[in-house]
């Protein structure tokens, strides 16, 4: 364990600094110049520095569980847990799940009524009794309901020609109902005859494109619990189709741009506002289904199995079954899917703030263990065989009191977890004894809390009418700085810098702003080590023979000397044996400046006065052209040809010398003077 602390001045701040931090409440534990923060350290460090074990404050996270035996069947226990969380330290508790036999089931059958499902509808009309019988084999309390869907009633999802809207079926003789997004036909009931009667009245419909509006329908089934009649029991949603599904974004094809709002919009048992809202996204639907404990069973034809298997990867607690082309095997399919769903248990929690982290260790009955997962997960769970999940909850800071819920997905049982902060230090109450604080304050965890008008480690400083802000002001570099740079105590308006436990570190300066260690490093040592330089207030002072911001360079200029042994050709300075050239000049020796403007135009008047003693500088040539030296012999360099003050062409060569704007100039004897017109 370690304790990384920053500006700690109370036991609470210490505990907040991390799980390895503990606080010593022993009196006079700090010496003169010691900061209060040295009371905050790891337990071994405090013990080593002479703090008795019973003076060390180290509150720990803990969990208290409560069982609630009121009410019927409970598959999850405990029902309530209270956690006291210290920042950074997990509290752990166990949750047991025992799968109950005969748990009540609500099953809602949601069917695609597009034309290709005609033969399926015939079979489903006869299904009521079989479905309830199958449910009653599993549970003593089963109910069934029915709904159907086609798609949004705008192009390109359906044909909007008036005739086609009245009868969308390809066969005109066939009695066929107009297309619709979702119709809630039968509220959940245990009356199989009613199922038969209501489903018997349903007519097939039709649409235009292959994917259907099934996600729209599922969203309404999840968002309208009162209308559907869901009880607080296992909720199954059988989704029967032979095709794919539209999802968020597809609405744009029909100029529907408003995102799906996840709310119930049933009027007269119809989703009448489907042409106002886009289809839901898969994630949005998954969230809604989980929130309402609904477990979808996708009963789909063979060519669609792969598609819907992909969907079940995103929707937790969902299953896929292969539906025969005429839906004749649907009862068998539902039984299998239910067994698969109810034998897999996911333990999860509702959304939490970033300050809380929850992980699960799953100890499954088949000997399989999953550790540190974002949710609990056990497969092959058998009736009445308990499985255990260890839940670990960690707070990253001192949290507000709050609670969250853990649930087994698809089941109605919940565990309510109340979370409280464990940040206070219950130090021995010495508030009666004021003598240690000069009678001007009381002790709190070994530190004086001074009365108004007094400040200082032992309340020894009277503010004398000056506000503590004023006194503290003279301990700040400026208004934005912290008192004594956070490295000293402000005693009566003066900084008393802390002693450091870091070897070789001395804190000093009017505001404790300086030290002998926070400088650049070279070879892992401050200022390259004591042999190269010393650290003074953030800057290295190098010993003779060394240079550089971390004294990393031996003071030599060999790499900066040009062939005439001029440092950086007089056009830069040598730092760490490398030239820093003036603007535009190039490394290594600042010899060339490819981007600099041509000097020709600049020196025409100098060429004129130096050679011919004419032109604007004729009278004071040497003062006007100090960097130029006339050569009697031709030189190598830049060749120039410019017009002089008399309009004559003058040819000259400039050979750059060391330094800035210094040239050797050779000017041709003859000028080209073109006579003007007569």
């Amino acid at each position: 364990q370690e304790c990384t602390k920053f500006k700690v001045s109370s036991c609470r701040e210490c505990i907040e600094s991390g799980p390895g931090c503990t606080w010593c409440q022993k009196l006079n534990f700090t010496g003169p110049g010691d900061p209060d923060s040295i009371r905050c350290d790891t337990r071994p460090q405090l013990l080593m520095r002479g703090c008795a074990a019973d003076d060390i404050m180290d509150p720990t996270s803990l969990a208290e569980t409560q069982e609630d035996h009121n009410g019927g069947q409970k598959q999850l226990s405990p029902q309530k847990v209270t956690l006291y969380l210290r920042p950074g330290q997990a509290a752990a508790f166990n949750v047991t799940f025992r799968r109950a036999k005969g748990y009540p089931i609500d099953l809602y059958y949601l069917m695609d009524l597009s034309y290709s499902m005609l033969d399926d509808l015939r079979n489903v009309k006869k299904l009521g009794g079989d479905l309830l019988r199958a449910l009653n084999e599993i549970t003593e309390s089963g109910r069934i309901g029915f709904g159907s869907f086609v798609d949004k009633t705008v192009l390109p999802f359906v044909n909007t020609h008036p005739d086609k809207l009245r009868n969308p079926c390809p066969n005109k003789e066939k009695e066929c109902q107009p297309p619709f997004a979702f119709r809630h036909v039968l509220k959940l009931t245990n009356n199989s005859n009613q199922f038969q009667t209501e489903v018997g009245k349903q007519l097939i419909s039709g649409n235009l494109d292959a994917p259907e509006g099934g996600l729209d329908a599922m969203m309404q089934v999840a968002a309208c619990p009162e209308e559907i009649g869901w009880r607080n029991v296992t909720r199954l949603l059988v989704f029967a189709t032979d095709d794919g599904f539209h999802f968020a974004g597809d609405g744009k094809l029909g100029a529907i741009l408003t995102p799906n709002d996840g709310r119930c919009h049933l009027e007269d048992n119809l989703y009448k506002r489907s042409n106002e809202f886009d289809y839901p996204s898969v994630g949005q639907l998954a969230h809604k289904l989980a929130e309402n404990n609904i477990q979808p069973i996708f009963a789909v034809t063979s060519r669609m199995v792969k598609t819907y298997e992909k969907l079940t990867e995103i929707i937790p607690k969902s299953a896929v079954g292969e539906l025969s082309e005429d839906s004749s095997n649907v009862v068998h399919l539902i039984k299998n899917a239910y067994n698969k769903l109810s034998s897999r248990v996911f333990l999860d929690h509702n959304a939490l703030p970033d300050t809380l982290k929850v992980t699960y260790d799953s100890f499954c009955s088949n000997g399989v263990t999953h550790r540190n997962q974002p949710r609990g997960d056990c497969d092959g769970v058998q009736i009445n065989v308990p499985i255990t999940f260890q839940v670990k909850v960690t707070a990253t800071e001192c949290i507000q009191e709050q609670s969250f819920v853990i649930r087994a997905l698809g089941f109605t049982d919940i565990v309510t977890v109340q979370v409280l902060p464990q940040c206070e230090c219950r130090c021995r109450d010495q508030s009666r004894d004021r003598s240690l604080c000069h009678g001007k304050g009381f002790l709190e965890c070994g530190i004086c809390r001074c009365d108004t008008g007094y400040i200082g480690k032992n309340c020894e400083c009277q503010t004398q009418g000056r506000s503590s802000q004023e006194l503290e002001g003279s301990c700040r570099k400026d208004n934005n700085s912290i008192i004594c740079s956070g490295l000293g105590d402000c005693v009566c308006g003066q900084c008393l810098c802390h002693t450091s436990d870091v070897p070789g570190k001395l804190i000093y300066g009017q505001y404790c702003e300086c030290d002998t260690i926070n400088c650049e490093r070279y070879n892992g040592q401050v200022c390259g080590g004591p042999g190269r330089g010393l650290c003074f207030c953030g800057k290295c002072r190098c010993h003779p023979g060394f240079e550089g911001s971390a004294c990393q360079c031996e003071r030599t200029t060999e790499g900066c000397l040009n062939p005439r042994r001029v440092e950086c050709s007089g056009r830069g300075r040598c730092r760490c044996n490398v030239c820093e050239c003036h603007s535009g000049y190039q490394l290594p020796l600042c010899q060339e400046c490819p981007g600099c403007p041509s000097p020709c135009g600049k020196y025409i008047s100098c060429a004129e006065c130096l050679k011919f003693e004419k032109g604007p500088f004729g009278k004071n040539c040497s003062a006007a052209c100090p960097g130029l030296q006339l050569s009697n012999n031709p030189v190598k360099g830049r060749t120039c040809k410019e017009r002089d003050s008399e309009g004559c062409w003058v040819a000259y060569t400039l050979e750059q010398q060391d330094g800035m704007d210094r040239y050797l100039i050779y000017v041709d004897e003859s000028r080209e003077c073109v006579a003007g017109p007569n």
């Epitope: 490398v578 030239c579 190039q586 490394l587 060339e592």
Partner: nanobody
């Protein structure tokens, strides 16, 4: 990493000529300036001549008029030494530079030039 290999050094009579060559390999694409240094026994190393990729040349006072530096491609540089004198006796080293960091830190093995009187 840059490697430099110097060649052409030998024993020559005063007044004679020699042509030194240096071939660079490795990160040659970034070279802008190449130069010849020399170090006589018991003396400091000194820069004799440099040539840039644009052809700009620069000479020490002792080399001016007698030595010519040339470059036949990005990574080969020559030093033509005429009218050699005994004081030109030294180990001659080649060096290369980039625009970004200045001289490469490494040195080649050097080539020995001895001028006898």
């Amino acid at each position: 990493e840059m490697q430099l290999v110097e060649s052409g050094g030998e024993l020559v009579q005063a007044g004679g000529s020699l042509r030194l060559s240096c071939a660079a390999s490795g990160s040659v694409s970034s070279i802008n300036v190449m130069g010849w240094y020399r170090q006589a026994p018991g003396k400091q190393r000194e820069l004799v001549a440099t040539i840039s990729s644009s052809g700009y040349t620069d000479y020490s006072d002792s080399a001016k008029g007698r030595f010519t530096i040339s470059r036949d491609n990005k990574n080969t540089v020559h030093l033509q030494m005429n009218s050699l004198k005994p004081e030109d006796t030294a180990v001659y080293y080649c060096r290369a530079s980039t625009l970004r960091t200045g001289w490469f830190t490494g040195w080649g093995q050097g080539t020995q030039v001895t001028v006898s009187s």
